[in-house]
């Protein structure tokens, strides 16, 4: 930021280093929550068309895949992962790619990830090889 | 090394239309992801739209999506923001920004990062 630009107030719009430089936000798929007809893949990509400019620099990647007796639904979205999302910790959020990790949740198989390069939440990948041997 | 100098802000009426833009000097401007980025009296940055220096694809925040409208011309070395529908919490200072590929932070007294600002004011 230019010498001549206040203070900020607000610092949660503003994630700065010992050095005061200013973190490019991250840019992340989406949707919300939207009907999706991924299953039984290895990989997804998430066919939402929204690239959003997360609104707090330190906020990360987040997609979450849910299927019970009716439906499957993929969510995509920003959010901060010092906060829990869906009661979950962002374990993964320094990842450069969203690897899926089943959670438990009652009544419906859930699985969500995670990560923190540009639009890495629009593929979702299931594949245990990934989990365990990709270095990426 | 690009320098950036943002102009066309001003006093509008809520839905009213202006036309933001940013001129940078230097012969490195289509090497550059260029952002435009907002700060409201007495809060943190808003990061507001994006743009690819190759094939132009644009990003925005929710809170501008549909409103906001990001574009360059890399033969004039000139960004722009057209923002229509302005709402009294769009009032704040515009600031455009460079980003080289791959980099993560803004150096923050670089004023090679940062123009000056233009003060964009919304009010009847």
């Known amino acids: 930021i230019p010498p001549h630009v206040q203070k900020s107030v607000n610092n949660d719009m503003m994630v700065t280093d010992n050095n005061g430089a200013v973190k490019f936000p991250q840019l992340c798929k989406f949707c919300d929550v939207r009907f999706s007809t991924c299953d039984n893949q290895k990989s997804c990509l998430s066919n939402c068309s929204i690239t959003s400019i997360c609104e707090k620099p330190q906020e990360v990647c987040v997609a979450v895949w849910r299927k019970n007796d009716e439906n499957i639904t993929l969510e995509t979205v920003c959010h901060d992962p010092k906060l829990p999302y869906h009661d979950f910790i962002l374990e993964d959020a320094a990842s450069p790619k969203c690897i899926m990790k089943e959670k438990k949740k009652p009544g419906e198989t859930f699985f969500m990830c995670s990560c923190s390069s540009d639009e890495c939440n629009d593929n979702i990948i299931f594949s245990e090889e990934y989990n365990t041997s990709n270095p990426d | 090394e690009v320098q950036l100098l943002e102009s066309g802000g001003g006093l509008v009426q809520p839905g009213g239309s202006l036309r933001l833009s940013c001129a940078a000097s230097?012969?490195?401007?289509?090497?550059?992801r260029m952002w435009w980025v907002r700060q409201a009296p007495g809060k943190g940055l808003e990061w507001v739209s994006a743009i690819e220096p190759i094939g132009h694809r644009t990003y925005y925040a929710n809170s501008v999506r549909g409103r906001f409208t990001i574009s360059r011309d890399n033969s004039k070395n000139t960004l722009y923001l057209q923002m229509n529908s302005l709402r009294a919490e769009d009032t704040a200072v515009y600031y455009c920004?460079?980003?080289?590929?791959?980099?993560?932070?803004?150096?923050?007294?670089?004023?090679?990062?940062w123009g000056q600002g233009t003060l964009v004011t919304v009010s009847s």
């Open positions: 230097g012969s490195t401007f289509t090497e550059y």
């Open positions: 920004a460079k980003q080289a590929p791959g980099e993560k932070w803004a150096r923050r007294w670089d004023l090679d990062y």
